[in-house]
Amino acid sequence: GSERTCCPVNWVEHERSCYWFSRSGKAWADADNYCRLEDAHLVVVTSWEEQKFVQHHIGPVNTWMGLHDQNGPWKWVDGTDYETGFKNWRPEQPDDWYGHGLGGGEDCAHFTDDGRWNDDVCQRPYRWVCETELDKASQEPPLL
C-alpha cells in the first residue's frame, strides 16, 4: 500500500509517530485489538521525552500501554527490547500482586496518575493509547 505521510483524523503527530488517546476504558486485550484493527499498537514508550508527551495528553488517569508479561517475561507489543529499553516503574513495581482477589497476578502495564508505571490486572477497564509510526501503510480512520 501507499505510505502514511500524515496522521489520521483525531490522531496526534509527535516525532514521526501518530497517537490516539481513548477517553473511555477497556480491558488490555480489547484495547490491544482496537489498536491493531486501526493498523496501530498500544503505545510503546522508548524515551523520557515520549513518556512526557504521553503523560501530558492522558493526564492523571490510569491508562494502558503496550507492555505485558502474560507469557512470562515483560514484552513490548512491537518487539522493542524490554531489558535494554526505557522504563519508568513506580517504586517496588512491577510486583505481580495477587492480593486483589480477582484471580492471578498482574500482567499488564499502565500509566498511573503520576505517569509512572504499575502492573495491574489485565481485565481492568482502563483508558489506552494507540501508536503507529509514520511511513507505514496508509490508513486514515474516518469519522462516523
Epitope: 500500500g1 473511555s24 477497556k26 484493527l37 496508509s138 490508513q139 480512520p141
Partner: antibody
C-alpha cells in the same frame, strides 16, 4: 455511490470450500477495517471475521477459527472470506460490513446486501 | 464472551405509538453499544452508536440511552417504515456480539 457488493455464495457440500468476495466502491477502501457478519435463516446476527485496513491484523470468531480466512486486496477494493471445511451450521447469509471507529469502538456503518451460503448434501 | 439479552422478543404496536426496546448485557460494556435496524430481505442498518449517538441520516425519532449493562432504544412515534427487527451489539469486549433481536410488528 458508497456501497458494498458481496458475491460467491452458493450451494456446497459439507467439507467443501467457498470463497466469498465483497467489492467496495465510493470510498477509500484501505482507510477502513472490514468485517464479515453472518445470519442463519430466521436467526440473529453473528460476527465472523475482521481485518484491519492494511490487512496486517485479522480476527476470527471461535466458531470459524482454523476454517475461515479473511483477506483483502486494496488494489482491487475487494474483501474476501475463504471458507474451508464447511459445515451445515455455516449455512447463512454472509454480509460484509465496513468498520467505522468512534471513541474506541468499531461500528458497522455500511453493509452489503449479503450472499447466501448453503451447506447441504 | 458478553451475552446481550433483548426484550421483548416481539413488540406489537400501532403507527404513532412509542416503542421502547431493551438490551441488557451480561457484564458492563460502558457505552460501547450500537443499535441496528433490519427489514425483511435487507441488510442491517446502523441506527445508534456509542449508546446514544444517531448515525448519519437517522431520523430524530430514534434515540438511544443507557450505559453499563442496561440500554434502551426508543422510537418516539412509530412510522410505517419502522416496523422491523432491531438488534443491539456490544463492542466493549472481544468478540463483538449481538443481541437476539426485537421484532416490532404492526398491531
Amino acid at each position: 455511490e458508497v456501497q458494498l457488493l458481496e458475491s460467491g455464495g452458493g450451494l456446497v457440500q459439507p467439507g467443501g470450500s467457498l470463497r466469498l468476495s465483497c467489492a467496495a466502491s465510493g470510498f477509500t477502501f484501505s482507510n477502513y477495517a472490514m468485517s464479515w457478519v453472518r445470519q442463519a435463516p430466521g436467526k440473529g446476527l453473528e460476527w465472523v471475521s475482521a481485518i484491519s485496513g492494511s490487512g496486517g491484523s485479522t480476527y476470527h470468531a471461535d466458531s470459524v477459527k482454523g476454517r475461515f480466512t479473511i483477506s483483502r486486496d486494496n488494489s482491487k477494493n475487494t474483501l474476501y472470506l475463504q471458507m474451508n471445511s464447511l459445515r451445515a451450521e455455516d449455512t447463512a447469509v454472509y454480509y460484509c460490513a465496513r468498520d467505522a471507529p468512534y471513541r474506541g469502538g468499531h461500528y458497522f456503518d455500511l453493509w452489503g446486501r449479503g450472499t447466501l451460503v448453503t451447506v447441504s448434501s | 464472551e458478553i451475552v446481550l439479552t433483548q426484550s421483548p422478543a416481539t413488540l406489537s404496536l400501532s403507527p404513532g405509538e412509542r416503542a421502547t426496546l431493551s438490551c441488557r448485557a451480561s457484564q458492563s460494556v460502558s457505552s460501547y453499544l450500537a443499535w441496528y435496524q433490519q427489514k425483511p430481505g435487507q441488510a442491517p442498518r446502523l441506527l445508534i452508536y456509542d449508546a446514544s449517538n444517531r448515525a448519519t441520516g437517522i431520523p430524530a425519532r430514534f434515540s438511544g440511552s443507557g450505559s453499563g449493562t442496561d440500554f434502551t432504544l426508543t422510537i418516539s412515534s412509530l412510522e410505517p417504515e419502522d416496523f422491523a427487527v432491531y438488534y443491539c451489539q456490544q463492542l466493549a469486549s472481544w468478540p463483538p456480539t449481538f443481541g437476539g433481536g426485537t421484532k416490532v410488528e404492526i398491531k
